[in-house]
């Protein structure tokens, strides 16, 4: 039987959720007037880039959209983007699609996502509402790299 992605709402410690704005992901306060994305998460079957200390390798997509999170270098800086791609198309590939891969690590009750293409760069939200979700190598005060995966199904 083919695997199915797991579905989660994603939230940070300041109760910010991920929201789709056009073809970008932004962080916005948890609110009745805001529709948070449902994150699709599925493990990569290929073990080529695996590193158990960093976590499980996963693909991340947006439920209901053919959009997946993707890392690319823009002007010399690792950048988080959304690319038109069905998460199951990535999953069925025999070879790991490195730019779409993230190490998913658990830290207590929170989840951390590190780019496989750019080790040391983590998915983050800033302290300001309405800002894009981005990649950072600075974990700490000025941004948030720890997320709660809330079951929505």
């Amino acid at each position: 039987r083919e695997a199915a992605p797991k579905s989660y709402a994603i939230r940070d410690s300041r109760q910010m959720v991920w929201v789709l704005s056009g073809n970008s992901l932004i962080a916005a306060p948890l609110s009745r007037s805001i529709k948070p994305v449902t994150l699709h998460l599925i493990a990569c079957r290929d073990t080529e880039f695996s590193d158990k200390e960093k976590g499980n390798m996963v693909y991340l997509g947006i439920k209901g959209k053919d959009l997946c999170l993707f890392c690319a270098e823009i002007q010399g800086k690792p950048t988080l983007q959304l690319k038109e791609k069905n998460i199951m198309d990535l999953y069925v590939e025999k070879k790991a699609q490195k730019p779409f891969l993230f190490f998913h690590n658990k830290e207590g009750s929170t989840s951390v996502f590190q780019s496989v293409s750019y080790p040391g760069w983590f998915i983050a939200t800033s302290t300001t509402s309405g800002q894009p979700i981005f990649l950072t190598k600075e974990r700490g005060i000025t941004n948030n790299t720890n997320f709660y995966l809330d079951s929505v199904e």
Partner: antibody, heavy 122, light 111 residues
Framework: ELQLQESGPGLVKPSETLSLTCTVS??????????WGWIRQPPGKGLEWIGS???????YYEPSLKSRVTISVDTSKNQFSLKLSSVTAADTAVYYC??????????????WGQGTLVTVSS | ESVLTQPPSVSGAPGQRVTISCTGS?????????VHWYQQLPGTAPKLLIY???NRPSGVPDRFSGSKSGTSASLAITGLQAEDEADYYC???????????FGGGTKLTVL
Amino acid sequence: ELQLQESGPGLVKPSETLSLTCTVSGGSITASNYYWGWIRQPPGKGLEWIGSIDYTGSTYYEPSLKSRVTISVDTSKNQFSLKLSSVTAADTAVYYCATGNYYETYLGFDVWGQGTLVTVSS
Amino acid sequence: ESVLTQPPSVSGAPGQRVTISCTGSSSNIGAHYDVHWYQQLPGTAPKLLIYGNDNRPSGVPDRFSGSKSGTSASLAITGLQAEDEADYYCQSYDYSLSGYVFGGGTKLTVL
């Protein structure tokens, strides 16, 4: 239907630790996306949030009380509890437990216990 | 001093309309966190009256309505009745405190 019931001593001596328990019925304390809070109301005054714990076990405390407060969950008894150390007369209040769901009440509290009066006095 | 500011008291005659304001800041209401309103009748626990700025839980009469704009919110009560005499509290979330915040409460007197 979810119901909450506070319990604990009504009288606590100054400098001691106030301990209260909130028993949850009609639902599981580990149910996804729920948060559980403690709110107090000094006599004749307004509501003051003390702290919360959610289904992940994450705790959040009012900054001015953080050094004295501990909130924990006992899943086997379907309860959550409040401990407030080094109490003074200023901690005399009616203590309420309350709950909400991140994706249904959006950081509001839709179910409350009836409250329990705690007096700090020697 | 409460993080959210409410008038200490308001009053109105039966049948009238009254409003209660709730003023916050850029780290709570102004940051687009929702505002919730509670009614506390004398000697009882608070009851959720409005959630998510303008939504009534089932059983709450449509005489009660909420709104929000910028860093402020308000609760309106139309067709005032004697049983509306109570304390009313607004509540939101504040990201700078990583916690829930309440207004100081407003005592509604029905004349």
